[in-house]
Interface confidence: medium
Amino acid sequence: AQNITARIGEPLVLKCKGAPKKPPQRLEWKLNTGRTEAWKVLSPQGGGPWDSVARVLPNGSLFLPAVGIQDEGIFRCQAMNRNGKETKSNYRVRVYQIPGKPEIVDSASELTAGVPNKVGTCVSEGSYPAGTLSWHLDGKPLVPNEKGVSVKEQTRRHPETGLFTLQSELMVTPARGGDPRPTFSCSFSPGLPRHRALRTAPIQPRVWEPVPLEEVQLVVEPEGGAVAPGGTVTLTCEVPAQPSPQIHWMKDGVPLPLPPSPVLILPEIGPQDQGTYSCVATHSSHGPQESRAVSISIIEPGEEGPTAGSVGGSGLGTLALA
């Protein structure tokens, strides 16, 4: 079968090879698409509701005035010329829609070195097939789950149009001493070949480095941060500095509005408690200093918990990721 790609909403003409140029013609088109159950036969006589979707032209070609997602499938024509010679045409039709230019929303203007940060969310609307979103740092592809890079993806389909909306949220952990002004961009790659990728405008957040002080230690009980549902997790922030600084807590990079305390207790753990926790020590004489981040997770009975609750990895590209 010959592969045909057609843009959604555009007209499509499929030639019926071997058919006489004008009536009378002995030909029939058979369709197996999202609009049909098994095979649908169309003849040059036409007529009926199918004419608005597909009709046979006087020259024997099949005309679809506006291709839709339901028109994906197999189209076959069987024609006999004046001498009784039979010719078959076979097409596989796939449709596509190029989305609008992707955009980065909720982008961070500043990232903190040494801790996970949300860079932004890349959004592409109106594609078919879905396609993919990928992130780039200084023009080089970022690989999820490597070197402090994590990506959360979501694909939604419009209930009426059938077109896809893609979302991709990028989290990175910039290393201390890395690029102070990294350039991030996101690109949409179509699901069908031969169409070039669409790239967002780049964003250039600043990387802020906390003042290095004596290390802030975050101790997790139970060790590893994995706990059965309903259990209790105790996080203790140990700071060697004197006088004792104020200790505040973060979850998934967001400050927890709680009274300052060197101990954070999570009783009766539930799914909403899962996430990445860290503590921030604020000294009167220096800026804030953040601990390593620990991952708190729920283990179902019989599961083995992680051996360590620390989050992180090693360098990446020009933006070293901790």
Partner: antibody, heavy 120, light 111 residues
Framework: QVQLQQSGAELVRPGTSVKVSCKAS????????IEWVKQRPGQGLEWIGM????????NYNEKFKGKATLTADKSSSTAYMQLSSLTSDDSAVYFC?????????????WGAGTTVTVSS | DIVLTQSPASLAVSLGQRATISCRAS??????????MHWYQQKPGQPPKLLIY???HLESGVPARFSGSGSGTDFSLNIHPVEEEDAATYYC?????????FGGGTKLEIK
């Protein structure tokens, strides 16, 4: 079962102070926050502040800074709220409630309330 | 401070029908995939009682006829079917940032 038992009603003179208590039982007192809420007769609810009984750390609603002082005694599992320089505007029911730490931050157990009446 | 506006201020609903109470925040109370909006029920002479936490999670022991929904700035509490014992004042409360604030309350009367 989990309970917060508040002290009884108070009738006090303007310009004086009052200390309301909230005794916790049935759970680990230092594992949760104690939050305080004000409700004037026939009115809605106003958050006063919260205390971490484990560390003694507090957060106050700006509106109640200087008016309310929150403390906690771990040995007796009791939280206290002192209200100073009382005026008729302070006449209300005061509730203590248990607050989740972490990021939930809702009030899952409430005391029955302490009525404070300021009158000369 | 985040202002929570509840509507209506009062409503009367027939037994077995649906009651819907709205709560609108002056700015978003959602972040990191969570909506920090909670709902309480208060009957005269009693303390408030937690019904729904984090916008849609039913507190244990609360009947399944109570449900919550919404995100960002717009939230609602639904009660269906309404029962006699549901006559009370309902409050929304956010915990997105300090200070926590409550809505003005909605008084539900059963017809």
């Amino acid at each position: 079962q989990v309970q917060l038992q508040q002290s009884g009603a108070e009738l006090v003179r303007p310009g004086t102070s009052v200390k309301v208590s909230c005794k916790a039982s049935g759970y680990a007192f230092t594992n949760y926050l104690i939050e305080w809420v004000k409700q004037r007769p026939g009115q809605g609810l106003e958050w006063i502040g919260m205390i971490n009984p484990g560390s003694g750390g507090t957060n106050y609603n700006e509106k109640f800074k200087g008016k309310a002082t929150l403390t906690a005694d771990k040995s007796s599992s009791t939280a206290y709220m002192q209200l100073s320089s009382l005026t008729s505007d302070d006449s209300a029911v005061y509730f203590c409630a248990r607050g989740r730490g972490g990021h939930y931050r809702y009030f899952d157990v409430w005391g029955a309330g302490t009525t404070v009446t300021v009158s000369s | 401070d985040i202002v929570l506006t509840q509507s209506p201020a009062s409503l009367a609903v027939s037994l077995g029908q649906r009651a819907t109470i709205s709560c609108r925040a002056s700015k978003s109370v959602s972040t990191s995939g969570y909506s920090y909006m909670h709902w309480y029920q208060q009957k005269p002479g009693q303390p408030p009682k937690l019904l729904i936490y984090l916008a849609s999670h039913l507190e244990s022991g609360v009947p399944a006829r109570f449900s919550g929904s919404g995100s960002g700035t717009d939230f609602s509490l639904n009660i269906h079917p309404v029962e006699e014992e549901d006559a009370a004042t309902y409050y929304c409360q956010h915990s997105r940032e300090l200070p926590w604030t409550f809505g003005g309350g909605t008084k539900l009367e059963i017809k």
